[in-house]
């Protein structure tokens, strides 16, 4: 069977929104009413990884998009980036782990460790209109708590 | 053993508010993603909101999403459903029930509490 | 979304009976399936999941099976308390929908 994908969207513990900013970049913002529509919707598959009850292996990509949120080394620093793929090959089960997430929730928190590299995060700025990154610190000035709502295929 | 205990289901007119609650005991509650189900009077089911283990996840389909809002204190055992907006077609027995997303499926189920949205 | 059909809608049968309730998704749900059980007056009982895996505690004459998008719920030996109204239930996207149900009753 194919894996499990399901879309949802991200807000900050700020509730701020993520968009498109560029073609390979996310940015967040504070939205409202209709320019919630500019939000980006994911698809969010339940991967293979090491699995808890508050720790769950995911993949986030783009809805009907080929680009999944990946983390790598750039200059010797964790970095989160958009990476096009063959849509033909993905999503699947078995992901790479560049691609894979450990989504951990845990008292009303939610936040997205890189499988990659442990103890790195999907972080926003608290200023707005600022690039989504892959934060090694949490509990600072750096958001790392996020809400998710899913939505209707 | 397992127990989900309803309450709040009421008689009231359109457009109005109704919140339910779900008293959860006999499993740790705060380790389990729930929802609301609803069976319209001789009617099937209709799955109406999700709220994840922690309370940082949510779901509602487009029939009620912008109207119902889910919410959850852990602390208290108890799961909640706000109904803003009601409309007469959400008359229905409204089931807390233990499941949602990511399992997929609804292993506990309360006994459910009735909603009439009447003039 | 996936709509689900079940068939029949209602049935007769005597006690002892086989019998099948089928359940057709619009498109392939890859074994996202449950079945629930609910007698009248009473909230909704798990039954089967994943399409053939019998939840805690359910008597072994209820069975699933199939793929794709065609499932079948068989009880291989109807017993009176079996009188019910059976779902089916997808949950491979959301939103995850619930078939219009089968009534059973003992002829």
């Known amino acids: 069977a194919p894996v499990r994908s399901l879309n949802c969207t991200l807000r900050d513990s700020q509730q701020k929104s993520l968009v498109m900013s560029g073609p390979y970049e996310l940015k967040a913002l504070h939205l409202q009413g209709q320019d919630m529509e500019q939000q980006v919707v994911f698809s969010m598959s339940f991967v293979q990884g090491e699995e808890s009850n508050d720790k769950i292996p995911v993949a986030l990509g783009l809805k009907e998009k080929n680009l999944y949120l990946s983390c790598v080394l750039k200059d010797d620093k964790p970095t989160l980036q958009l990476e096009s793929v063959d849509p033909k090959n993905y999503p699947k089960k078995k992901m790479e782990k560049r691609f894979v997430f450990n989504k951990i929730e845990i008292n009303n928190k939610l936040e997205f460790e890189s499988a990659q590299f442990p103890n790195w995060y999907i972080s926003t700025s608290q200023a707005e209109n600022m690039p989504v990154f892959l934060g090694g610190t949490k509990g600072g000035q750096d958001i790392t708590d996020f809400t998710m709502q899913f939505v209707s295929s | 053993e397992v127990q989900l205990v309803e309450s709040g289901g009421d008689v009231v007119q359109p457009g109005r508010s109704l919140r339910l609650s779900c008293s959860a005991s006999?499993?740790?509650?705060?380790?389990?993603?729930m929802s609301w189900v609803r069976q319209a009077p001789g009617k099937g089911l209709e799955w109406v909101a999700y709220?994840?283990?922690?309370?940082?996840?949510?779901y509602y389909p487009d029939t009620v999403k912008g109207r119902f809002t889910i919410s959850r204190d852990n602390s208290k055992n108890t799961l909640f459903l706000q109904m803003d907006s009601l409309r007469p077609e959400d008359t229905a027995v409204y089931y807390c029930?233990?499941?949602?997303?990511?399992?997929?499926?609804?292993?506990?189920w309360g006994q459910g509490t009735l909603v009439t949205v009447s003039s | 979304g996936i709509q689900m059909t079940q068939s029949p809608s209602s049935l007769s049968a005597s006690v002892g009976d086989r019998v099948t309730i089928t359940c057709r998704a619009s498109g392939n749900i890859y074994d996202y399936l449950t079945w629930y059980q609910q007698t009248p007056g009473k909230a909704p009982k798990l039954l089967i999941y994943?399409?053939?895996t019998l939840a805690e505690g359910v008597p072994s004459r209820f069975s699933g099976s199939g793929s794709g998008t065609d499932y079948t719920f068989t009880i291989s030996s109807l017993q009176p308390e079996d009188i019910a109204t059976y779902y089916c239930q997808h949950f491979w996207t959301l939103p995850y929908t619930f078939g219009q149900g089968t009534k059973l009753q003992i002829t």
């Open positions: 006999g499993f740790i509650f705060s380790k389990y993603d």
């Open positions: 709220i994840s283990h922690g309370g940082a996840g949510t």
């Open positions: 029930a233990r499941g949602g997303v990511y399992k997929g499926y609804f292993d506990e």
């Open positions: 994943n399409a053939k």
